[in-house]
Interface confidence: medium
């Protein structure tokens, strides 16, 4: 218990801490500029991303991951992600050439809090939003996805890239820049303005006026290529992928000594290369160029192919599976991949979260709860089952008139009416003689408790069903001595048999009362009786806690990924979607203990472990 004074002190401390503790601000920002998105060159290029006559617009998503670290599947965009604004609306013009599509304004910016890793993986998705009048608002679909791994120093110039995804082509530029006070190629060094009373670290000279201290001293080795080199310490020159040499000016796999052309160098004895097909490195995406007798050849890094390594082939190395998906590559490391998606996600990259509640799975007014890893229905009072499909008390609040008894079953109540009444609620008077119940010409008389038959000569019984034979023999069993045949009023049973019949009738009456309380079950195995222990949340986690009935043992499909199978058990009256199992709270005590049979993990509950004929007692 915290006193008011103590709580005031606590809140003051929190406020002070918030003021004086350093605020978490990004170390830097990765910026992505999309230049164009449209059909790529070559045959089979799509005319338009929009469906015929339906306007659409584009937007982009970028996902960044540290390139060299093995990222956990749960954090697919460990460096961050960003979504662009929606682009202008585009409508396909019939017959017009396929254009580059109108793009969203501005940059995609991904702030990063920690050090910029230098090597990173990116995934850029192009999404289409269709603006037709479809039910449920606009429809989104993924048009293209490109991915790659790059080296990039923070603070460097914009790097340009072209990527192809299927028949689409995406042109873009990107850079990483530090946010003050962070500086350096990894944005790990902090600087204060010159006015602040501090000095830079060892080996750093004071800054020029109006410049930030520590900013100026980081100068790479003189002549270090600004396009292909970078430095993290003053005076060094480190090369981006695909480049080598002391100043990062030599493409990998090309050496001046290998070229047969050009004059010899006096200092090295090597041939000084003249202009050749590999000059300027025509190989994109870090590919290395080597000359061939006729032209050049690119050796592409993993995940790229094409004459100039310009085509991106996304592989598992690019981490393309979102939302904890497991990436399974093809037999060849460079071949296509398949994302195995966890429950609740689908799509080729597990990028689509299924709004399973929109399918309205909960019946009878149940509330649908999508908990991510599980889909649950919270049932209204009186309903149970994974989708609230079982009516626990069909008769609640419904009365049967004129002494009728309510019988539940199948989600709707039914009245078993007293003799002389009929209709849904036993409100209609019924003529018990209308059905001509008296056999062999017997006359029927209606009566407050039912009917009476006056039998024609030669017949007897409640419905005149037994003939009385002229020779004195009866259709009934032989009467004990001293009794006249055809005298049912005085036809006595032996005491033991009489007791047995009485017990049977009493038992049947009890059973009928129970049936009327609990309801007829069409399938004895499709209903759980009370007395079944409620599953404990500690017993078996997830779907194994669901009590399964005979009907649910392997008939019906396994759940689709949209209906995710692995679920939690909630003992607070929430019913777990795990069709066709039933997990219900019970309301009545059974007459007989349930019989537990069947395979492990299943319970079959037999409603009446007695012959069913006992239920036909009139």
């Amino acid at each position: 218990m915290v006193s008011p004074r103590m709580s005031g002190l606590l809140s003051q401390t929190v406020i002070l801490a918030l003021i004086f503790l350093p605020q978490t601000r990004p170390a830097g920002v990765f910026e992505l500029q999309i230049h164009s998105f449209g059909p790529g060159p070559g045959p089979g290029a799509p005319r338009s991303p929009c469906s015929a006559r339906l306007p659409c617009r584009l937007f982009f998503r970028v996902c960044l991951k540290p390139g060299l670290s093995e990222e956990a599947a749960e954090s697919p965009c460990a460096l961050g992600a960003a979504l662009s604004a929606r682009g202008p609306v585009y409508t396909e013009q019939p017959g017009a050439p396929a254009p580059d599509l109108p793009l969203p304004d501005g940059l995609l910016q991904v702030p990063f809090r920690d050090a910029w890793p230098g090597t990173f993986s990116f995934i850029i998705e192009t999404w289409r939003e269709e603006l037709g009048d479809q039910i449920g608002g606009p429809a989104w679909s993924l048009l293209a996805r490109v991915a790659g791994r790059r080296r990039l120093a923070a603070g460097g110039p914009w790097a340009r890239d072209i990527q192809r995804a299927g028949a689409w082509e995406l042109r873009f530029s990107y850079r990483a820049r530090c946010e003050p006070p962070a500086v350096g190629t990894a944005c790990t060094r902090l600087c204060r303005p010159r006015s602040a009373p501090s000095r830079c670290g060892p080996g750093l000279r004071p800054c020029a006026p109006l410049e930030d201290e520590c900013e100026a001293p980081l100068v790479c080795r003189a002549g270090c290529s600004p396009e292909h080199g970078f430095c993290e310490q003053p005076g060094e020159c480190r090369c981006l992928e695909g480049w080598t040499g002391p100043l990062c000016t030599v493409p990998v796999s090309t050496s001046s000594c290998l070229s047969p052309r050009g004059p010899s160098s006096a200092t090295t004895g090597c041939l000084v290369p003249g202009p050749g097909p590999c000059d300027g490195n025509p190989c994109a995406n870090g590919g290395s160029c080597s000359e061939t007798p006729r032209s050049f050849e690119c050796t592409c890094p993993r995940g790229f192919y094409g004459l100039r390594c310009e085509v991106s082939g996304v592989t598992c190395a690019d981490g393309p599976c979102f939302n904890g998906g497991l990436c399974v590559g093809g037999a060849d490391p460079d071949s296509a991949y398949i994302c195995h998606c966890p429950p609740g996600f689908q799509g080729s990259n597990c990028e689509k979260r299924v709004d399973r509640c929109s399918l309205q799975p909960c019946r009878n007014g149940g509330l649908c709860l999508d908990l991510g890893h599980a889909l649950r229905c919270r049932c209204r009072a009186g309903f149970a089952g994974p989708r609230c499909e079982h009516d626990l008390d069909d008769c609640a609040g419904r009365a049967c008139a004129n002494g009728g008894t309510c019988v539940e079953g199948g989600g709707a109540h039914r009245c078993s009416c007293a003799l002389g009444f009929g209709g849904r609620d036993c409100r209609e008077r019924a003529d018990p003689c209308a059905a001509r119940p008296c056999a062999h010409g017997g006359r029927c008389y209606a009566h407050f408790s039912g009917l009476v038959c006056a039998c024609a000569p030669g017949y007897m019984g409640a419905r005149c069903e037994f003939p009385v034979h002229p020779d004195g023999a009866s259709a009934l069993p032989a009467a004990p001595p001293g009794l006249r045949p055809g005298d049912p009023q005085r036809y006595l049973l032996p005491p033991a048999l009489g007791l047995l019949v009485a017990a049977g009738v009493a038992g049947a009456a009890l059973l009928l009362v129970h049936v009327r309380r609990r309801g007829h079950s069409q399938d004895a195995g499709s209903r759980l009786l009370a007395g079944t222990p409620e599953p404990s949340v500690h017993a078996l986690p997830d779907a194994l806690n669901n009590l399964r009935t005979q009907e649910g043992s392997g008939d019906g499909p396994s759940s689709s990924v949209d209906w995710n199978r692995p679920e939690d058990v909630d003992p607070q009256g929430i019913y777990v979607i795990s069709a066709p199992s039933i997990y219900a709270r019970e309301v009545a005590t059974p007459l007989f203990p349930p019989l537990h049979t069947g395979r492990a993990g299943q319970r079959q509950h037999l409603l009446f472990p007695y012959p069913s004929s006992i239920l036909s007692v009139k």
Epitope: G330, A331, C339, H340, C341, Q346, P557, S558, S560, V561
Partner: nanobody, 119 residues
């Protein structure tokens, strides 16, 4: 539709081994991916292992060295051999089956088999 039945779960001591089996039946296709998903109480679920139609395997970091996934296409089955089991491997293991039709992946899940690692 596809039905999946897992077996092989049970109680095992830390450091012990267990092999889970899963059989797919129903309208299965040869172009499918299979694997295992596990959920422990109060933990986020994960996919420890998967195998593609051509037999390529993938493992989560937590399962890389200790678990081996294999499949028998003739029997429409997938297996998970788990060695050096630890307490944190205790979970319900669900077999899954994906097949792609017209670019859409359909996923199916079994009922699960409980693996308890405890001394």
């Amino acid at each position: 539709e596809v039905q999946l039945v897992e077996s092989g779960g049970g109680l095992v001591q830390p450091g012990g081994s267990l092999t889970l089996s899963c059989v797919a039946s129903g309208s299965t296709s040869s172009i499918n991916a299979m694997g295992w998903y596990r959920r422990a109480p109060f933990k986020q679920g994960e996919l420890p292992a998967g195998i593609s139609p051509d037999g390529t395997k993938a493992y989560a970091d937590s399962a890389k060295v200790r678990f081996t996934i294999s499949r028998d296409n003739a029997k429409n089955s997938v297996y998970l051999q788990m060695n050096s089991l630890r307490a944190e491997d205790t979970a319900v293991y669900y077999c899954y089956y994906f097949h792609t039709v017209c670019g859409t992946s359909m996923g199916y899940w079994g009922q699960g088999t409980l693996v308890t690692v405890s001394s």
